[in-house]
Amino acid sequence: MKVLQEPTCVSDYMSISTCEWKMNGPTNCSTELRLLYQLVFLLSEAHTCIPENNGGAGCVCHLLMDDVVSADNYTLDLWAGQQLLWKGSFKPSEHVKPRAPGNLTVHTNVSDTLLLTWSNPYPPDNYLYNHLTYAVNIWSENDPADFRIYNVTYLEPSLRIAASTLKSGISYRARVRAWAQCYNTTWSEWSPSTKWHNSYREPFEQH
């Protein structure tokens, strides 16, 4: 049994890091493998993560840890029984993938403006809380070409757009994701999408 692709890990910069790797053949990750992780700090104890399958030869492990600070560094040991398959380290602050925003809501009752709001996925005492920017994806269920991205570079988790920028009388979906420039993070996963029927009053034509 050998590791084909070494574990790569990302942290939510809160309390969960996710590590993924590939073995050289089909593997029952949860029964055959263990990922031990330990904060490099006096008196910290090692923890065991039981991986789950992620495709035939792929494994994924969710590491639970105390709230991350930028200096944290973890040792990682991947074991198959008594055999050490791989040894490495992971600094959560250097590999951040933010949590996905939540509670995306489309408010359609503000004259002819669409107001999209969502929740910041971090509590106010987390460093990322004031450093997230967002991308909002809106697309038509009827027309795959009607697909647009709005970059929200201010801190407020909301976006206003004129309903008339979208086609009237059809259904749209929206989703949102986040990233933080300060830690050069990757993008978060997309939030669950929300659906609404777009309709607005056409302005009278002037003759």
Epitope: S15, I16, R34, H47, T48, C49, I50, L64, M65, D67
Partner: antibody, heavy 119, light 106 residues
Framework: QVQLQESGPGLVKPSETLSLTCTIS????????WSWIRQPPGKGLEWIGY???????NYNPSLKSRVTISVDTSKNQFSLKLNSVTAADTAVYYC?????????????WGQGTTVTVSS | DIQMTQSPSSLSASLVDRVTITCRAS??????LNWYQQKPGKAPKLLIY???ILQSGVPSRFSGSGSGTDFTLTISSLQPEDHAVYFC????????FGGGTKVEIK
Amino acid sequence: QVQLQESGPGLVKPSETLSLTCTISGGSISTYYWSWIRQPPGKGLEWIGYIYYSGNTNYNPSLKSRVTISVDTSKNQFSLKLNSVTAADTAVYYCARHRGSYVYGMDVWGQGTTVTVSS
Amino acid sequence: DIQMTQSPSSLSASLVDRVTITCRASQTISSYLNWYQQKPGKAPKLLIYGASILQSGVPSRFSGSGSGTDFTLTISSLQPEDHAVYFCQQSYSSPTFGGGTKVEIK
């Protein structure tokens, strides 16, 4: 598929010792944490203690003076002893496996065994 | 000991309703929070660990969120088989459970 089975007397007299064993089938006791949990009739869940396969233990502070949990890796079993029982110890007793270290939830449970403390 | 307070203690909701149960810890527990479902006469079943990670095999209508002291279990669309008692449990220190929330179908 890992299965857990609790066994032991269903009736214990006050002031005596309650003894239960959890037998693990379909998997190994190694590399996991194992807990005992109890649930008095119509009430919530109370964690009693856990043991690592190497023998390290941690007990509920409110029960610590009366509890011993031990492990027998050769039999794939771990056991609970609770001394000086009273009627308040009447409950369904469950054994369970943590899905990794103790910081993870308990993903495999026995079906539970009812223990009544009565003279 | 860390006290876990669940609310409400019981609720009644209609099929396909969105149901939310909250759990509050008496001190910060990071994301060391697990949710269980228990049906009458059965052992508890792990739904979510690490506050938000869905246990393998659990339907995606269950989700968890929160960190620190305040946590939420959400059932996005209540199904008949969701009639049960739900418990939260912290694993930051010696494990303790919330008092449970009984979910009934209207």
